[in-house]
């Protein structure tokens, strides 16, 4: 057989036996020939360098560029392919050598003892182990070990080839930790040399260092850095680390195999780096390199090495915090220190504890923040070794975007008596206050009518050319009163009236209140009517299990037929054009009522009564009369509210406190309950009687003693109580200094 | 800034043996997996051997298998190719090449090695 | 062992203008990790090969934006937009996923 390229000038070499496949026995001499057009040389099987003993080359006794090849004596093991070659080119002529021995069917490898094969785990790939044949055609089983498994050539993927050896799927013999091949001949076995079998992966999935981030010492310390690396099954690693001081003398390196789960397609190996009393020149960039010889894989980590432990805020910590109602507050403890403070939260010089709605860590979490969270909070941070403290206050301050005190769901509103002087009120509260409150009007039929605007809960009256209050042309005389502050129920707030002079129109009103962090607005429904009128008997709104009337009075001359309606939950959507008060058009929702008519000389008066009122009877009261003459039905709505009972509180406490004799004591106690409370007060258990030195005011909310004298110290008590109980608090007046003994000295007495 | 210098290229015949060697600096050697790459005249490169960061670990593609040895010397910084039994289809250009995550992110300039009688 | 295979041995290109070089495998290089491990290089006339693209699609430190690599499990695209002068040279694939690692035939990128 030829090998290499053609050439113009040289033929290839020619060898004395014509043939690319020679078959001899053993224990014969191999003797070929080789001639050529220029200097030869030969390599064959097991030693290509020419130094084997029993091999000799000799020139050609009949010509130049001739060399003969000379084996006496032959063995199975010098099968293989003898290559005639011109020096220092590609162009040879290769004869295979099939040496037959019988009782050694499988060439050996020099000096080998055993051989390695090396497999990958993988469906895809073959291995092929290299027994290969002294005899062409044997019948060749590839034996595997442990457990002991026979692979036989299928024609397919596994096959034997006397040149090349026994091919098979690497996955098939995986398991194994040795195989090797065998030949039957005349029921004699033969078997090849041992190969054993090297499973290799190579691919690391990840390098991982623990701790992984953040890692600060203090001078003296112990540094534990360990370095995992997760790999495909059958790799190997060699473990490096890089580091500051890398020659330092205390100094641990351990490497070792971690145990994975059974069926695990993964392996984990740990190395772990130890420098026991870290000193300031350790600080720096630690590194560690995984590598299974294919694959390197690395990962690095700062280690910060400090003088001592010490703490201190971070130059971004806040001083103050703004907010608006129901949004998540989060305010970041932002500290340089080593090791990790301890972070102590407090409100007001409260401690805060973690719950639902608050976390106090690291970071201090308002989950929907109210207007009771505004405060001061200082964050208090401990160093746990030097215990040293430092503290930091974050005001917070939450805003309120404008509410509108009366707004409420939709609902068809009062009616006006025609004529009269009327004031619509909107109480805003909010924070910061508003920067301004604008009345707007629109009339009610232009916003009613309008069939191609939808009305929505949130929004009830489709309006959108709303008018400022400036421009009260073809409505009703308006003046908006200066806006007044009050205190309501503890909270600041704007009141801004609107009074109508006359009402002659049906109209819409609207208030809108801004402040930096929203808008608020109230429309009031302004239905003006010739109709009915309703009171309340008596004029003030009812309480729980107190009794209230509901007068209807009409003129008889002009109305029949009066009639008390409640006002059922209306069905949603609600139609527009039935809008602001549809109820004379839609009796399907009015609920008939029991009442009683009085006369008087000029109006019928058609009282309903509500004895022991109930929250369940809160709502809309209509009362309907109709027209003598056109028989047109005419509706007057009245929203009744009824006050919950609630038991007496007294809120603020009353303080301990110390005064000198002739000095003054003014102390107040606020209640409130529904209904309201009465207030007394009690000296040691006693009831207290004014008298020329003890003054109750405001309903004795305040108390003022005058000219204090020893006998005043004592145990004080202010208690407020209604028909559902009672509240109290009590504190003890001291009195300091002698007592001036003079006639003019007229005092009062306690009973 | 990174280098690597191989040497030891040269002629040798068939039968014959040599050793290159790879000189690496501008990083730090030992945390890095190395290979040997050669490209014979005209052909495609053709990975031949690498090895771990320790030397522990060593693979060889089956044409080299046996007749070629890698290791490394942390200490010198230099990396080596063991060649015996060489051939004449082992004559290329052998570059050496550093290894991360299984790339081979610079490479040496190369030394050429020639096997012929 | 896996081939991979570059069918265009030479592409003339224009300066300024955008091609396009193809790489295939004989087997998918999408790895049960979910990243595809091939690898481009460019080896310039008389200099040693240079990583440009690894993980199929992630350029190499230093590498200009106007190469990209992109592909399915076997079928690769390196693409280079407005070609210049230094871009010329070689361009070899190479696969990850198994071992031995082995690189295409290269295709030479020539100027018209």
């Known amino acids: 057989a030829s090998v290499g390229l053609p050439s113009v000038s040289l033929d290839l070499p020619r060898l004395s036996i014509q043939k690319d496949i020679l078959t001899i026995k053993a224990n014969t001499t191999l003797q070929i020939t080789c001639r050529g057009q220029r200097d030869l040389d030969w390599l064959w099987p097991n030693n290509q360098s020419g130094s084997e003993q029993r091999v000799e080359v000799t020139e050609c006794s009949d010509g130049l560029f001739c060399k003969t090849l000379t084996i006496p004596k032959v063995i199975g093991n010098d099968t293989g392919a003898y290559k005639c070659f011109y020096r220092e080119t590609d162009l040879a002529s290769v004869i295979y050598v099939y040496v037959q021995d019988y009782r050694s069917p499988f060439i050996a490898s020099v000096s080998d003892q055993h051989g390695v094969v090396y497999i990958t785990e993988n469906k895809n790939k073959t291995v092929v182990i290299p027994c290969l044949g002294s005899i062409s055609n044997l019948n060749v089983s590839l034996c595997a070990r442990y457990p002991e498994k026979r692979f036989v050539p299928d024609g397919n993927r596994i096959s034997w080839d006397s040149k090349k050896g026994f091919t098979i799927p690497s996955y098939m013999i995986s398991y194994a930790g040795m195989v090797f091949c065998e030949a039957k001949i005349n029921d004699e076995s033969y078997q090849s040399i041992m190969y054993i079998v090297v499973v290799v992966g190579y691919r690391i999935y990840d390098v991982v260092l623990s701790p992984s981030h953040g890692i600060e010492l203090s001078v003296g310390e112990k540094l534990v850095l360990n370095c995992t690396a997760r790999t495909e099954l059958n790799v190997g690693i060699d473990f490096n680390w890089e580091y500051p001081s890398s020659k330092h003398q205390h100094k641990k390196l351990v490497n070792r195999d971690l145990k994975t789960q059974s069926g695990s397609e993964m392996k984990k190996f740990l190395s772990t780096l130890t420098i026991d009393g870290i000193t300031r020149s350790d600080q720096g960039l630690y590194t560690c390199a995984a590598s299974s010889g294919l694959m390197t894989k690395k990962n690095s980590t700062f280690v910060r090495v400090h003088e001592k432990p010490f703490v201190a805020f971070g130059s971004g910590m806040e001083s103050l915090v703004e907010a608006t109602v129901g949004e998540r507050v989060r305010i970041p403890a932002k500290y340089l220190g080593y090791p990790p403070p301890e972070i102590k939260w407090y409100k007001n010089g409260i401690p805060l504890e973690s719950n639902h709605t608050i976390k106090a860590g690291h970071v201090l979490t308002i989950m929907e923040v109210s207007e009771r969270d505004t405060g001061n909070y200082t964050v208090i941070l401990t160093n746990p070794i030097s215990k040293e403290k430092q503290s930091h206050v974050v005001s917070l301050v939450v805003y309120v975007p404008p509410q509108i005190g009366e707004k409420s769901l939709i609902s068809p509103v009062d009616s006006y008596q025609y004529g009269t002087t009327q004031t619509l009120t909107c109480t805003v509260y909010a924070i910061p206050p508003p920067h301004h409150i604008h009345w707007y009007w629109q009339l009610e039929e232009e916003c009613a009518n309008e069939p191609s605007h939808a009305v929505s809960v949130t929004n009830p009256y489709p309006c959108e050319e709303w008018r400022s209050v400036e421009d009260f042309q073809g409505g009703n005389k308006i003046e908006v009163n200066k806006n007044q502050f009050a205190l309501i129920e503890g909270k600041n707030k704007t009141v801004s009236t609107l009074v109508i002079q006359a009402a002659n129109v049906s109209a819409l009103y609207k208030c809108e209140a801004v402040n930096k962090v929203g808008r608020g607005e109230r429309v009031i429904s302004f239905h003006v009517t010739r109709g009915p009128e309703i009171t309340l008997q008596p004029d003030m709104q009812p309480t729980e299990q107190e009794s209230v009337s509901l007068w209807c009075t009409a003129d008889r001359s002009t109305f029949e037929n009066l009639t008390w309606y409640k006002l059922g939950p209306q069905p949603l959507p609600i139609h527009v054009g039935e809008l602001p008060t549809p109820v004379c058009k839609n009796l399907d929702t009015l609920w008939k009522l029991n009442a009683t008519m009085f006369s008087n000389s000029t109006n019928d008066i058609l009282i309903m009564e509500l004895k022991n009122a109930s929250l369940q009877d809160q709502g809309d009261y209509v009362c309907l009369a109709q027209d003598r003459k056109t028989k047109k039905r005419h509706c007057v709505v009245r929203q009744l509210t009824v006050l919950e009972r609630v038991a007496p509180t007294i809120t603020g406490n009353l303080e301990n406190q110390t005064t000198s004799i002739g000095e003054s004591i003014e102390v107040s106690c606020t209640a409130s309950g529904n209904p309201p409370p009465q207030i007394m007060w009690f000296k040691d258990n006693e009831t207290l009687v004014e008298d020329s030195g003890i003054v109750l005011k405001d309903g004795n909310r305040n108390l003022t003693i005058r000219r204090v004298r020893k006998e005043d110290e004592g145990l004080y008590t202010c208690q407020a109580c209604s028909v559902l109980g009672c509240a109290k608090v009590e504190a003890f007046f001291i009195i300091e200094g002698a007592q001036e003994k003079t006639n003019l000295e007229h005092h009062h007495h306690h009973h | 800034e990174v280098q690597l210098v191989e040497s030891g290229g040269g002629l040798v015949k068939p039968g014959g043996s040599l050793r290159l060697s790879c000189a690496a600096s501008?990083?730090?050697?030992?945390?890095?997996?190395m290979s040997w790459v050669r490209q014979a005249p005209g052909k495609r490169l053709e990975w031949v051997a690498s090895?771990?960061?320790?030397?522990?670990?060593?693979y060889y593609a089956d044409s080299v298998k046996g007749r070629f040895t890698i290791s490394r010397d942390n200490a010198k910084n230099t990396l080596y190719l063991q060649m015996n039994s060489l051939r004449a289809e082992d004559t290329a250009v052998y570059y050496c090449?550093?290894?991360?995550?299984?790339?081979?992110?610079?490479w040496g300039h190369g030394t050429t090695l020639t096997v012929s009688s | 062992d896996i081939v991979i295979t570059q069918d265009e041995l030479s592409l003339p290109v224009t300066f300024g203008e955008s091609v396009s070089i193809s790489c295939r495998s004989s087997?998918?290089?999408?790895?049960?990790?979910?990243?595809?491990?091939l690898n481009w290089f460019l080896q310039r006339p008389g200099q040693s090969p240079q990583l440009l693209i690894y993980?199929?699609?992630t350029r190499a430190s230093g590498v200009s934006d106007r190469f990209s690599g992109s592909g399915s499990g076997t079928d690769f695209t390196l693409k280079i937009s407005r070609v210049e002068a230094e871009d010329v040279g070689i361009y070899y694939c190479?696969?990850?996923?198994?071992?031995?690692?082995?690189f295409g035939s290269g295709t030479k990128l020539e100027i018209k």
């Open positions: 087997k998918s290089l999408l790895y049960k990790d979910g990243k595809t491990y």
């Open positions: 501008g990083f730090t050697f030992s945390m890095y997996g």
């Open positions: 090895i771990s960061i320790g030397g522990s670990y060593t």
């Open positions: 090449a550093r290894e991360m995550d299984g790339n081979y992110d610079y």
């Open positions: 993980l199929m699609s």
């Open positions: 190479q696969q990850l996923v198994e071992y031995p690692f082995t």
